[in-house]
Interface confidence: low
């Protein structure tokens, strides 16, 4: 015998109460498949979280961050706040990258320049809060005769990182 | 569910006080950090202050320091924000928000209560 619920069709669930007969969620669930015995609350994007699609009869609402924040987690279940380059998120808020360090893009931690001399470079261009340092050829290679320096790649735009 | 609702805002006079709740539920409240935003209109969030799950560190803004106190009662679930002389440009939403520690240099403030407005105006 075929089970009467699986002819409910998403939006709707199979209603005990009713002789299973398929009733409409109710406002703010969802069901997004067929053959559902309840639907299910809808997502509330309050306070830091932003409604980036509504919520529907078959479909859950969805979303992100207000300006100033980004997402974290599966379906953007965090919001966590932007710093700007050059800078990281600690428990107090934006702070600058210590000496030593930089950060390009407007979330993560800052990390530690490249130390060229360990793959037997120098130092092309100085490391700042939101660049890291340029390593360059090393001394041998700069002796007369030697090939022209490439000039570094453009940095890729900060903050587009996928999640 | 995790839920967390402020209240106690209001419109007050330069130079009063207000003191903002926040009751949170459906999590081991005494665990976390917890921590006050606000949000001034037109301009972005702004953090306050926060408290950790002890109620032993306590850190707050530059700009509220030595006029805003922090506090929790763990028993009651509640986190509060005591704001004396209070200024115009203390007008804003206030949240109050569970933070989430997972490694260092990333805060996530990953539960927010619905927000209570504090106007400050004469």
């Known amino acids: 015998l075929q089970d009467p619920c699986s002819n409910c069709p998403a939006g709707t669930f199979c209603d005990n109460n009713r002789n299973q007969i398929c009733s409409p969620c109710p406002p703010n669930s969802f069901s997004s498949a067929g053959g559902q015995r309840t639907c299910d609350i809808c997502r509330q994007c309050k306070g830091v979280f932003r409604t980036r699609k509504e919520c529907s009869s078959t479909s859950n609402a969805e979303c992100d961050c207000t300006p100033g924040f980004h997402c974290l987690g599966a379906g953007c279940s965090m919001c966590e706040q932007d710093c700007k380059q050059g800078q990281e998120l600690t428990k107090k808020g934006c702070k600058d990258c210590c000496f030593g360090t930089f950060n390009d893009q407007k979330r993560g931690i800052c990390r530690p320049w490249t130390n060229c001399s360990l793959d037997g470079k120098s130092v092309l261009v100085n490391g700042t809060k939101e660049r890291d340092v340029v390593c360059g050829p090393s001394p041998a290679d700069l002796s007369p005769g030697a090939s022209s320096v490439t000039p570094p790649a453009p940095a890729r735009e900060p903050g587009h990182s996928p999640q | 569910e995790v839920q967390l609702v402020e209240s106690g805002g209001g419109l007050v006079k330069p130079g009063g006080s207000l003191r903002l709740s926040c009751a949170a539920s459906?999590?081991?409240?005494?665990?976390?950090?917890m921590s006050w935003f606000r949000q001034a209109p037109g301009k972005g969030l702004e953090w306050v202050s926060h408290?950790?799950?002890?109620?032993?560190?306590?850190d707050y803004a530059d700009s509220v320091k030595d006029r805003f106190t922090i506090s929790r009662d763990n028993a009651r679930n509640s986190l509060y924000l005591q704001m004396n002389s209070l200024r115009a440009e203390d007008t804003a939403v206030y949240y109050c928000?569970?933070?989430?520690?997972?490694?260092?240099?990333?805060?996530?403030?990953?539960?927010w209560g619905q927000g209570t407005l504090v106007t400050v105006s004469s």
């Open positions: 408290i950790s799950g002890s109620g032993t560190t306590i």
């Open positions: 459906g999590f081991a409240f005494s665990d976390y950090y």
């Open positions: 928000a569970r933070e989430d520690i997972r490694m260092p240099g990333t805060t996530d403030f990953d539960h």
